[in-house]
């Protein structure tokens, strides 16, 4: 009868999350009698696994009939493998005694645990930026083992480069996060536009996981402020109108000012969406000049998103001549811009109408 | 520590039947077999038969086939051994016994069971 | 089936001296590399005690006085110095097949 020997003869063993482990252990000899136990980890602080002789270890099954004559197998099955089962596993062989005494341990088979990375989530910044400005966005990925991956970002389906990547811990771990950032420069065009961000695993069969984020959550388009005036009608009214052009979002304010004061305030709402994302929206407001012995001076004063107001004036002349000779009376706009601390730039060209 | 502890003595008529129970502690019940044996005053041992509680597979002495019946309550760790249509010499102490090493021996042992027949 | 058949029936032997008893089964109980051989002690009033499994290997706690050995059909338990509380009636079991028990051996001191 040969000296016992405990047999495990697979060093390592990789499994996926929520399968079933087979960790196999075999003894050459009957002699001595005792239980096998299965520990995970070495040392005091082992833990224990499986006791064939007592405790109720629900997740682990023995392969053979512990009660099977002649058995020297002594192979586990845990079900349901989680990241956390990720470890170095011992069969070990006690000679029964009072208590049963350690007699030979196994060499030891590693378990890992192929995990799945989670759905990576991409958040955006806190608050809206500008075109021209640079945005950073992050994504999250967490609960994946082994430990290599790979994350790449997009934008609009063309891969960006300037983003950077941690996978943590850097240490050995039971299972991994990743975290990218990546900084995008937005344009005036990417309300339309989306951030993709793609991560690559072993355990997803070369079908990546994506995450999105939309730019439209991320930017905001401000307005260009156009004035046009109709010629006057016969009742000696002049419509103007304030043409906003080009936003976005669409929490937009309108006031108009006569000289000053508040004439009419409007929130903007279900506006047709241009095709780039963006809105247009016209106000109006008609003008009684007979009403007035000077000039009118108009103001279109624009709320956009939360940010300072931007005005754009307009002065409608109104004729020194009184009406019934048949005097002319002109409207002008004199195309100024007050900006307050915005940077919107004025495209606008002055207008000068002349209306008889 | 293993422990096997039997039911009280039982005194019978011949004809009757008696159940013995065995309740096991100290280790997982369904990992060992139980063998019963008994032994008649001054006499040697007798094997019975033994059962797995895991599965109630069992094996009797072809002397004691007919008569006995061993079950087990794994819900308490039970086991039992029925012996029917008794008679004068099945006056014994009866042993239950926990095979440890499956090798179809007797490791630990209850204190012991006595049965009497008598009319 | 396999009959075991031990021998003497009864030993008287003086303290400190060598006590031998011998088991011959009708048949080979070697299987599996193995002798399914095993041998109990029973003190008076009290239960059997595993001594020896599988013809040589001791169990946990037996004193090394007490020894097996054989193979195939004949076997033997040796206590290689007598002491007081050894006085028993040894029994030998086979389990090649279903278990059965030699019908035992009466030690006392002479």
């Known amino acids: 009868e040969e000296e016992l020997q405990v047999i495990q003869p697979e060093k390592s063993v990789s499994v996926a999350a929520g399968e079933s482990a087979t960790l196999n252990c075999t003894a050459t000899s009957l002699i001595p009698v005792g239980p096998i136990q299965w520990f995970r980890g070495v040392g005091p602080g082992r833990e224990l696994i499986y006791h064939q002789k007592e405790g109720h270890f629900p997740r682990v099954t023995p392969v053979s009939d512990p009660t099977k004559r002649n058995n020297m197998d002594f192979s586990i099955r845990i079900s349901n493998i989680t990241p956390a089962d990720a470890g170095t596993y011992y069969c070990v062989k006690f000679r029964k005694g009072s208590p049963d005494v350690e007699l030979k341990s196994g060499a030891g088979t590693e378990l890992s645990v192929r995990a799945k990375p989670s759905a990576p989530v991409v958040s955006g910044p806190a608050v809206r930026a500008t075109a021209e400005h640079t945005v950073s966005f992050t994504c999250e990925s967490h609960g994946f083992s082994p430990r290599d991956i790979t994350l790449k970002w997009f934008k609009n389906g063309n891969e960006l480069s300037d983003f950077q990547t941690n996978v943590d811990p850097a240490g050995k771990s039971v299972s991994y996060s990743i975290r990218s950032t990546a900084r995008v420069v937005l344009t005036r065009r990417d309300v339309h536009s989306q951030v993709i961000c793609e991560v690559a695993h072993v355990t997803l069969q070369g079908d990546p996981l994506r995450g999105t984020a939309n730019l439209s959550e991320a930017i905001r388009v401000p307005p260009f402020l156009e004035f046009t005036q109709q010629s006057m009608r016969a009742d000696n009214q002049v419509n103007v109108t304030c043409q906003v052009m080009k936003f976005y979002p669409q929490r937009l304010q309108l006031t108009w000012l006569e000289n000053g004061n508040v004439s009419r305030t409007e929130m903007a709402s279900a506006l047709p969406e241009n095709k780039d994302g963006t809105y247009n929206w016209t106000s109006w407001l008609l003008v009684n000049v007979s009403a007035h012995r000077d000039d009118v001076k108009l103001t279109c004063q624009v709320e956009h998103d939360g940010q300072p107001a931007v005005n754009k004036s307009f002065s409608v002349k109104v004729s020194a001549h009184p009406k019934e000779q048949g005097s002319n009376t002109a409207a002008e706009n004199t195309g100024t811009n007050e900006r307050g601390s915005s940077d919107y730039k004025d495209d606008d060209d002055k207008h000068h109408h002349h209306h008889h | 520590q293993v422990q096997l502890v039997q039911s009280g003595a039982e005194v019978k008529k011949p004809g009757a039947s008696v159940k013995v129970s065995c309740k096991a502690s100290g280790y997982t019940f369904t990992n060992y077999w139980i063998n019963w044996v008994r032994q008649a005053p001054g006499q040697g041992l007798e094997w019975i038969a033994m059962i797995d509680p895991s599965d109630s597979e069992t094996h009797y002495n072809q002397i004691f086939k007919d008569r006995a019946t061993l079950t087990t309550d794994t819900s308490t760790s039970t086991a039992y051994m029925e012996l029917r249509s008794l008679r004068s010499d099945d006056t014994a102490v009866y042993y239950c016994a926990m095979d440890y090493g499956s090798l179809y021996a007797m490791d630990y042992w209850g204190r012991g069971t006595l049965v009497t027949v008598s009319s | 089936d396999i009959v075991l058949t031990q021998s003497p029936d009864s030993l008287a032997v003086s303290l400190g001296e060598r006590a031998t008893i011998n088991c011959r089964a009708s048949q080979s109980v070697r299987s599996s590399g193995y002798n399914w051989i095993f041998w109990y002690q029973q003190k008076p009033g009290q239960p059997p005690k595993l001594l020896i499994y599988?013809?040589?290997n001791r169990d946990s706690g037996v004193p090394d006085r007490f020894s097996g050995s054989g193979s195939g059909t004949d076997f033997t338990l040796t206590i290689s110095s007598l002491q007081a509380e050894d006085v028993a009636v040894y029994y030998c079991?086979?389990?090649?097949?279903?278990?059965?028990f030699g019908q035992g051996t009466k030690l006392e001191i002479k």
């Open positions: 599988l013809a040589s």
């Open positions: 079991q086979e389990s090649r097949e279903l278990p059965t």
